[in-house]
């Protein structure tokens, strides 16, 4: 419903960290926003992390979440940590304007995150 923009491709760092911006076009004056990161593989969709925040306040994920983020206006800067090669896939940003009514929901087209496991260091004779 809402327009949600996110980059098409992101390469994770060698430490398994990937960051991208999720931007939404708000039709109204939402004060409470929920952002969810979904991972889609074939026809399976799994929730990676989610956070609800009040406009003007910081984005707070659960303590054990692999995600962190900051918000600024209608932009959310998302960071996913602890990624490994097997986590390579399409990560979709879902934004919901929770309060006040009306409820709006928007789905981004997804960001393909590529994760390359670092090569193990060769044994050294020094």
């Amino acid at each position: 419903a809402m327009h949600v923009a996110q980059p098409a491709v992101v390469l994770a760092s060698s430490r398994g960290i990937a960051s991208f911006v999720c931007e939404y076009a708000s039709p109204g004056k939402a004060t409470e926003v929920r952002v969810t990161v979904l991972r889609q593989a074939d026809s399976q969709v799994t929730e990676v992390c989610a956070a609800t925040y009040m406009m003007g306040n910081e984005l707070t994920f659960l303590d054990d979440s692999i995600c962190t983020g900051t918000s600024s206006g209608n932009q959310v800067n998302l960071t996913i940590q602890g990624l490994r090669a097997m986590d390579t896939g399409l990560y979709i940003c879902k934004v919901e304007l929770m309060y006040p009514p009306p409820y709006y929901l928007g789905i981004g087209n997804g960001t393909q995150i590529y994760v390359i496991d670092p090569e193990p260091c060769p044994d050294s004779d020094f």
């Epitope: 419903a1 039709p27 109204g28 979904l38 026809s43 009306p102 709006y104 929901l105 789905i107």
Partner: antibody, heavy 115, light 108 residues
Framework: EVQLVESGGGLVQPGRSLRLSCTAS????????MNWVRQAPGKGLEWVAQ??????????YYSDSVKGRFTISRDDSKSIAYLQMNSLKTEDTAVYYC??????WGQGTTVTVSS | DIQMTQSPSSLSASVGDRVTITCGAS??????LNWYQQKPGKVPKLLIY???NLADGVPSRFSGSGSGTDFTLTISSLQPEDVATYYC??????????FGGGTKVEIK
């Protein structure tokens, strides 16, 4: 208190036109995407049309069954949404509901298309 | 267009029973789904939005679950006032915002 009041329904012959109005109060009309949903006698709900708001350039969308015949519009200064229905068919007979987002619903207005 | 398939089309259950209604989408809709209740002769009322969120004033015996393509509306303990027809609706852009065919719930 949120109110949506539909008007303009009635009995009309096939091929003729009718314009429905939806007057809103009790909420910020300009923040809402407005929809029309209809329900034929004894049948289920059918989404008909949607008009978005200014941040979305007042984009409009229609169900295939009414595309080219119905036109949705809005006047934010008056908090009114409209549904202009042309070339009416007997299968357009239904109760027409106006909705704000999908959160708020009006009481509906009955449109009967019959010769 | 994405099709929404609701089942069953009708059911009869006793007061206090747990009632489950399912709604399937022909494509992934990421939780972009609402549930409505329409009592006989009345206007439809929003029950659940975004697949899982309870609308204001809706009793806690109603709950929604699901993601992807398969969704469920559950009434944990059916009450006489729950006699109604229940509809799911896809709210993912682009429209059409298709409704399911409806499930009529009656008391045994």
């Amino acid at each position: 208190e949120v109110q949506l009041v539909e008007s303009g329904g009635g009995l009309v012959q096939p091929g003729r036109s009718l314009r429905l109005s939806c007057t809103a109060s009790g909420f910020t009309f300009s923040d809402n995407w407005m929809n029309w949903v209809r329900q034929a006698p004894g049948k289920g709900l059918e989404w008909v049309a949607q008009i978005r708001n200014k941040p979305y350039n007042y984009e409009t969308y229609y169900s295939d069954s009414v595309k080219g015949r119905f036109t949705i519009s809005r006047d934010d200064s008056k908090s009114i949404a409209y549904l202009q229905m042309n070339s009416l068919k007997t299968e357009d007979t239904a109760v027409y509901y106006c909705t704000g987002g999908m959160d708020y619903w009006g009481q509906g207005t009955t449109v009967t298309v019959s010769s | 267009d994405i099709q929404m398939t609701q089942s069953p089309s009708s059911l009869s259950a006793s007061v206090g029973d747990r009632v489950t209604i399912t709604c399937g989408a022909s494509e992934i809709i990421y939780g972009a789904l609402n549930w409505y209740q329409q009592k006989p002769g009345k206007v439809p009322k929003l029950l659940i939005y975004g697949a899982t969120n309870l609308a204001d004033g809706v009793p806690s015996r109603f709950s929604g679950s699901g993601s992807g393509t398969d969704f469920t509306l559950t009434i944990s303990s059916l009450q006489p006032e729950d006699v109604a027809t229940y509809y799911c609706q896809k709210i993912l852009s682009p429209p059409p915002w298709t409704f399911g065919g409806g499930t009529k719930v009656e008391i045994k």
